[in-house]
Amino acid sequence: EPPTACREKQYLINSQCCSLCQPGQKLVSDCTEFTETECLPCGESEFLDTWNRETRCHQHKYCDPNLGLRVQQKGTSETDTICTCEEGWHCTSEACESCVLHRSCSPGFGVKQIATGVSDTICEPCPVGFFSNVSSAFEKCHPWTSCETKDLVVQQAGTNKTDVVCGPQDRLRDPGGGGGRLVPRGFGTGDP
């Protein structure tokens, strides 16, 4: 009876289990009743990093100097090339497909440490009482405006991305020593 599943490092084809090709080799022909799977090593600048039945090897990644990339680790028949950025530049992603001078901190985050030749910008979330409404590589989180020091009241609460909105007090204390009595704006305050 033909198998319905195969062992590890095997694959099912034409009702029989064939060996997969090892890393660094590609499939030339499937096994038969009488022959083993035929595999061939990947060529120069090619690789396959898993046990496989691929008929083509993958091309090594090209570290394009025009994008600021250089080879960090040369690829082998079993591993891809690893790129990194020129000194002072930083990868845009883990895959390092392009380089930027430094990354920016998004709204809601402030710069904790400005980038150097060695380390990229370090961002930190703005804590309560602070905000950042810009993308920046140098601006820290800014403190919310203190409405009280301007003799105003908070009309809209601040967030990590927005400042508070201050506005005039609806009712002002009577300056005439009226026992702390609240008076509507414009009444007895000299306002027009």
Epitope: L67, W89, V100, L101, H102, R103, S104, V134, S135, E139
Partner: nanobody, 116 residues
């Protein structure tokens, strides 16, 4: 296509002054944070100064604080760096950069040499 063209470099004596300019095109200049960075011979990139899109907030590296002033004219799409009290250690190629700056977007830079 982003283009940044730096100018104003040259040979100057220690204690002298220079004003660098950076003419920007290919993007909406007034929307971007801008930076000056420099690379001294045989050394890595140093971030010198930055300015926010409106020109109201700035950053200076400790090495240039009190001597350099960054500014921008959004109507002329131009970034400036006024450099006073220049020292031998300010000798470098100066580049302007937008945020974010991709390697492929960088300008050619302008060489500043401080020497007697």
């Amino acid at each position: 296509e982003v283009q940044l063209l730096e100018s104003g470099g040259g040979l100057v004596q220690p204690g002298g002054s220079l004003r660098l300019s950076c003419a920007a095109s290919g993007f909406t200049f007034r929307d971007y944070e801008m930076w000056w960075v420099r690379q001294a011979p045989g050394k890595g990139l140093e971030r010198v100064s930055a300015i926010n899109p409106q020109g109201t907030r700035t950053y200076y590296a400790d090495s240039v604080k009190g001597r350099f002033t960054i500014s921008r004219d959004n109507s002329k799409n131009t970034l400036y760096l006024q450099m006073n009290s220049l020292r031998a250690e300010d000798t470098a190629v100066y580049y302007c950069a937008k945020l974010p700056t991709y390697f492929s977007d960088r300008g050619q830079g302008t060489l500043v040499t401080v020497s007697s």
